[in-house]
């Protein structure tokens, strides 16, 4: 099974080596999740032609996937550490329902899908410890998530393939933006 960063032998602190700082641990965690997403996308691309679809064609969807915008304070122009951290955590919490949807979408990469989901939960916990303004973080309503999940699972096969591809691509771009921003903090 895929291991979380810090669980494999490479990450065990060698004698006299410095333990990872909170920021380094978060950085490493995001890179680990991105590796997992990339592995999942390989399976998706091998079984459907979604990866060849243009970004514009894929944009014609009803998914409300989290995305970084200028107002979120994560871009260098208008950078705001507190606002940005809230956006990253809120976005990750919003992605959780979509990561749950992915759990039954993979055959050979089932464990990888689980690892991405679990390490995202751990990442959220790390970031919540770092955040000062926890009150500003809105958690999605469980009932809303449940009905969204039901709706996504009721789609036909082609739409489910499209949804899977879109979730993975959007999650990748959200994490890349988050990593760039976190390295400025």
């Amino acid at each position: 099974a895929p291991v979380l960063p810090g669980e494999d032998s490479k990450d065990v602190a060698a004698p006299h080596s410095q333990p990872l700082t909170s920021s380094e641990r978060i950085d490493k965690h995001i890179r680990y999740i991105l590796d997992g997403i990339s592995a999942l996308r390989k399976e998706t691309c091998n079984r459907s032609n979604m990866c060849e679809s243009s970004k514009e064609a894929l944009a014609e969807n009803n998914l409300n996937l989290p995305k970084m915008a200028e107002k979120d304070g994560c871009f260098q122009s208008g950078f705001n550490e507190d606002t940005c951290l809230v956006k990253i955590i809120t976005g990750l919490l919003e992605f959780e329902v979509y990561l749950e949807y992915l759990q039954n979408r993979f055959e050979s990469s089932e464990e990888q899908a689980r690892a991405v989901q679990m390490s995202t939960k751990v990442l959220i916990q790390f970031l919540q410890k770092k955040a000062k303004n926890l009150d500003a973080i809105t958690t999605p309503e469980p009932t809303t998530n449940a009905s969204l999940l039901t709706k996504l699972q009721a789609q036909n096969q082609w739409l489910q393939d499209m949804t899977t591809h879109l979730i993975l691509r959007s999650f990748k771009e959200f994490l890349q933006s988050s990593l760039r921003a976190l390295r400025q903090m």
């Epitope: 990339s38 060849e52 260098q76 390295r183």
Partner: antibody
Framework: EVQLQESGPGLVKPSQTLSLTCTVS??????????WSWIRQPPGKGLEWMGV???????YYKPSLKSRTSISRDTSKNQFSLQLSSVTPEDTAVYYC???????????????????WGKGTLVTVSS | QAVLTQPPSMSGTLGKTLTISCNGT?????????VSWYQQLPGTTPKLLIE???TRVSGIPDRFSGSKSDNTASLTISGLQSEDEATYYC??????????FGGGTHLTVLG
């Protein structure tokens, strides 16, 4: 040693689509976290980044060229391609393909450093 | 019209030190350590010298060094040699998922 070679017609008529292919040797475009870029240079002018296709097959384009540009890849042939539609004489340039993605570029989505380049191919847009 | 601003031409003396500047904004050069520098000798392909603002690429002599302050990046060439006569380009990642080049600086090395 990674080598890149551009190929395609040297002359394209205005309003037509310019199509170029970059063949990569000495390394697979489907392995490691590299991305593959297109850059052009009009005669006597500077370099202009056009777009990139990353390890996952995701594409990103220069905003002002986005509506006319398409980059795709064929991993079985170890090639990636550029299509530029509705060309005008202003699109006359030497077109380069290049490899990008040193360091943490994949994780950050920052493909600004191109370490291996093709020799370039001159494309003239003229009737 | 290049997004990053470089002086179009500069000249330096053999053996001396010269610095080429590259001015951008908080959306590109200021957005992180995502700056590279290229050397293009007449009639040849651009060659990567520096990536990540300061990291010299393998095989590039330590006479070449890169730095950054706020929205301005710099390439410094010390101990100028005649073979350094070329056009130098800076490039940077630009938010979001974009790359921009400078207009290029043609360097002439004087005896």
């Amino acid at each position: 040693e990674v080598q890149l070679q551009e190929s395609g017609p040297g002359l394209v008529k205005p309003s037509q689509t310019l199509s170029l292919t970059c063949t990569v040797s000495g390394g697979s475009i489907a392995t490691s976290y590299y991305a593959w870029s297109w850059i052009r240079q009009p005669p006597g002018k500077g370099l202009e980044w056009m777009g990139v296709i990353d390890y996952d097959g995701d594409t990103y384009y220069k905003p002002s060229l986005k509506s006319r540009t398409s980059i795709s890849r064929d991993t079985s042939k170890n090639q990636f391609s550029l299509q530029l539609s509705s060309v005008t004489p202003e699109d006359t340039a030497v077109y380069y393909c290049a490899r990008a993605g040193l360091g943490d570029s994949y994780y950050l989505g920052t493909y600004y450093a191109m370490d291996y380049w093709g020799k370039g191919t001159l494309v003239t847009v003229s009737s | 019209q290049a997004v990053l601003t470089q002086p179009p031409s500069m000249s330096g003396t053999l053996g001396k030190t010269l610095t080429i500047s590259c001015n951008g904004t908080s959306s590109d050069i200021g957005s992180g350590n995502y700056v590279s520098w290229y050397q293009q000798l007449p009639g040849t392909t651009p060659k990567l010298l520096i990536e990540g603002v300061t990291t010299r690429v393998s095989g590039i002599p330590d006479r070449f060094s890169g730095s950054k302050s706020d929205n301005t990046a710099s390439l410094t060439i010390s101990g100028l040699q005649s073979e350094d006569e070329a056009t130098y380009y800076c490039a940077s990642y630009r938010e979001t998922n974009n790359v921009v080049f400078g207009g290029g600086t043609h360097l002439t090395v004087l005896g």
